[in-house]
Amino acid sequence: AGVFELQIHSFGPGPGPGAPRSPCSARLPCRLFFRVCLKPGLSEEAAESPCALGAALSARGPVYTEQPGAPAPDLPLPDGLLQVPFRDAWPGTFSFIIETWREELGDQIGGPAWSLLARVAGRRRLAAGGPWARDIQRAGAWELRFSYRARCEPPAVGTACTRLCRPRSAPSRCGPGLRPCAPLEDECEAPLVCRAGCSPEHGFCEQPGECRCLEGWTGPLCTVPVSTSSCLSPRGPSSATTGCLVPGPGPCDGNPCANGGSCSETPRSFECTCPRGFYGLRCEVSGVTCADGPCFNGGLCVGGADPDSAYICHCPPGFQGSNCEKRVDRCSLQPCRNGGLCLDLGHALRCRCRAGFAGPRCEHDLDDCAGRACANGGTCVEGGGAHRCSCALGFGGRDCRERADPCAARPCAHGGRCYAHFSGLVCACAPGYMGARCEFPVHPDGASALPAAPPGLRPGDPQRYL
């Protein structure tokens, strides 16, 4: 069970020449209301057939009086949503008729007069629980803009509102084989009524009355643990007699996907990837053409004119999918260079650049050193979007303004003593070590490890770091 919701955004003249006359006048003020009629998508009934999925009537809109000589504007609309409750499963594909009615409020005898102003119709695919889908339909010179969605009524969830949700029994997680109910993560999918006696821990069912075993369990009620030692195949179904997992049909064996669909196994069942023009659990639904307006989000439908024609949707920027139904996460392509932050605004991408970078994609490295001075003889080095000073000996800090203590980093190894010097630092090495930083041990026989001590210096002498 659930509710189909329709939000009318605007009703007014469509683009192009031949703007319609306003439906109301000073002599005959009027107001609009809307009627929606829903049918399962594969109904073969004519337009006059009953609204098998349900129908709804909006409230009356505000009274409107035409301004003389003015073109018909977007007309004032009723408040609120049109809601069509559905009792059974949501069919996934549905046909709709949306009618715009005019209620004339003149001095008619016997109350207001009603007349049909425009009727639009189409066939759409829609999963329950999904986001609002936007649509534009034209009827003659009129244009109707609207959004719609289907949502499940608790405890039903899922794209067809056929799964049930129940509050969690345990606070931490759902029971074996049961998923949390997105978006109600504090609830769990309610189990179907499986075959009587089916193990609640090791069995599950996808149809009422069946008992299918989780891996490692077998038997008609999934109560027999599998002994895999003498078994040849890791796949079920389980053999109750041997307690083995014997080779058997997987969910994709025999390909349950019709019309050339390809089957892939899922942990609990199978999934069909359908060729263009087919959809449904087993790709059994067909017959959608460009006439049905199957391309969402302003996609351009291209295809033949026949009842069996396939179609292709050319999607506008920012959308993808066979019906342009998926919003592209354009930021996932990381279009912003040099660490810029990507913002997808829907109509456009924006990059917020780090300091030192500019351009639509942060591709321009600004001249970081322009107008920057490094003190005390330091030189400016560009890089990473920020300037850096390479300081002269004895100076440090961001702009080389600080007098450096060359001994602060304890540069002399092996206990050597560091002395600050006007041109750098000097290490006085401990006995047994030598080198500019006292890094080389002196061998007992007087020979040093490479490199050799320069001539004129005895091992152990203080050596100035040049």
């Epitope: 073969e44 006439a291 049905d292 351009l300 291209v302 295809g303 004119a305 009842p307 024609s309």
Partner: antibody, heavy 121, light 112 residues
Framework: EVQLVESGGGLVKPGGSLRLSCAAS????????MSWVRQAPGKGLEWVGR??????????DFAAPVKGRFTISRDDSKNTLYLQMNSLKAEDTAVYYC????????????WGQGTLVTVSS | DIVMTQTPLSLPVTPGEPASISCRSS???????????LDWYLQKPGQSPQLLIY???NRASGVPDRFSGSGSGTDFTLKISRVEAEDVGIYYC?????????FGPGTKVEIK
């Protein structure tokens, strides 16, 4: 501007052959289902046959009077439709129109200006 | 094959007055997808045919709103709310449900 320009018509003897061409421009040819429709002098319209677009399989269908004698082909790279007419009969005399129909956002249905085929001895 | 019939075959009209043409098919043109595969064409004197209405009731691009199509199944109607002089010519209905596509015999509309 959308244009369908037929060519190849003319006078041919019964039993002879003729190949008509239809050059398309101004729309995306390979999306369209293409048909030939003819009109005998002073008569109504008669559908001859069609070729589907590539995504619908590019298959052909024909009206009973021409089946087995006429073939339709298309060269999407040249935006051209062909009608090969063999074993022509006097009753094939007509103006032959090339038509394109399908969807490109909106429904479209374009017709050429026609080319006259006269079958006479 | 689906046979199409039209009435009347000739229709004298007065400019500014409404006109109506009927088209009947030998079998239903309503497809299971809910659309009626019937088109209306106008062939003006010396010209190629032009599409007026597709799928039974949808006005083709650029067609004035005085033209409207209605009907379902086997019975269809083309209405002109106010005939203009430029509307003269032969009107054909065509079924596009199944091949071979077939045309009606045509209705000749002329000014009285």
């Amino acid at each position: 501007e959308v244009q369908l320009v037929e060519s190849g018509g003319g006078l041919v003897k019964p039993g002879g052959s003729l190949r008509l061409s239809c050059a398309a421009s101004g729309f995306i040819f390979n999306n369209a289902g293409m048909s030939w429709v003819r009109q005998a002098p002073g008569k109504g319209l008669e559908w001859v046959g069609r070729i589907k677009n590539k995504i619908d399989g590019g298959t052909t269908d024909f009206a009973a009077p021409v089946k087995g004698r006429f073939t339709i082909s298309r060269d999407d790279s040249k935006n051209t439709l062909y009608l090969q007419m063999n074993s022509l009969k006097a009753e094939d005399t007509a103006v032959y129109y090339c038509t394109a129909r399908g969807w490109y956002g909106d429904y479209f249905d374009y017709w050429g200006q026609g080319t006259l085929v006269t079958v006479s001895s | 094959d689906i046979v199409m019939t039209q009435t009347p075959l000739s229709l004298p009209v007065t400019p500014g007055e409404p006109a109506s043409i009927s088209c009947r098919s030998s079998q239903s043109l309503l497809h299971s997808n809910g659309y009626n595969y019937l088109d209306w064409y106008l062939q003006k004197p010396g010209q190629s045919p032009q599409l007026l209405i597709y799928l039974g009731s949808n006005r083709a691009s650029g067609v004035p709103d005085r033209f409207s199509g209605s009907g379902s199944g086997t019975d269809f109607t083309l209405k002109i709310s106010r005939v203009e002089a430029e509307d003269v010519g032969i009107y054909y209905c065509m079924q596009a449900l199944q091949t071979p596509f077939t045309f009606g015999p045509g209705t000749k509309v002329e000014i009285k």
